[in-house]
């Protein structure tokens, strides 16, 4: 019997990114974001 399998062809990876607040403003501390599929979403 033939076996059929659906495959979207790609995986979406996510990664935590951390930035320093002073690089993007004047505050102290770190900002944590999430990159999904190459796009920072949070």
């Amino acid at each position: 019997d033939a076996e059929f399998r659906h495959d979207s062809g790609y995986e979406v990876h996510h990664q935590k990114l951390v930035f320093f607040a002073e690089d993007v403003g004047s505050n102290k501390g770190a900002i944590i974001g999430l990159m999904v599929g190459g796009v920072v979403i949070a």
């Epitope: 990664q15 935590k16 990114l17 951390v18 930035f19 320093f20 607040a21 002073e22 690089d23 993007v24 102290k28 501390g29 770190a30 974001g33």
Partner: nanobody
Framework: AVQLVDSGGGLVQAGGSLRLSCAVS????????MGWFRQAPGKEREFVGA????????YYADSVKGRFTISRDGAKNTVYLQMNSLKDEDTAVYYC?????????????????WGQGTQVTVSS
């Protein structure tokens, strides 16, 4: 061109302390975000921690939080990694690295300047 020179590695007993230094030359020190990475044999190079350009903010990997401290001395153009309560699993080659402002601090590809690395061996 910006150059980073690591030093201070060595052999230390578990539970001991070591301070690594990274001297920065050839660039404007205050414009470079600095971080430390490490690479154990057979493993990927991993993020250890970073310090902001002003030195006001630091961020650490969970594995070293509370044990390692990063500081920077603008007068000497040097960044330090103070390592306390060292464990066997801290054995690795340690690299300091520099990145442009505005880039993510915890990923390797943000960093375009690298030191040559200094070996830290923790023995039990």
């Amino acid at each position: 061109a910006v150059q980073l020179v690591d030093s201070g590695g060595g052999l230390v007993q578990a539970g001991g302390s070591l301070r690594l230094s990274c001297a920065v030359s050839g660039g404007t020190f205050s414009s470079i975000g600095m971080g430390w990475f490490r690479q154990a044999p057979g493993k990927e190079r991993e993020f250890v921690g970073a310090i902001s350009r002003s030195g006001d903010s630091t961020y650490y990997a969970d594995s070293v939080k509370g044990r390692f401290t990063i500081s920077r001395d603008g007068a000497k153009n040097t960044v330090y990694l103070q390592m306390n309560s060292l464990k066997d699993e801290d054995t690795a080659v340690y690299y300091c690295a520099g990145r442009p402002a505005g880039t993510a601090i915890n990923i390797r590809r943000s960093y375009n300047y690298w030191g040559q690395g200094t070996q830290v061996t923790v023995s039990s």
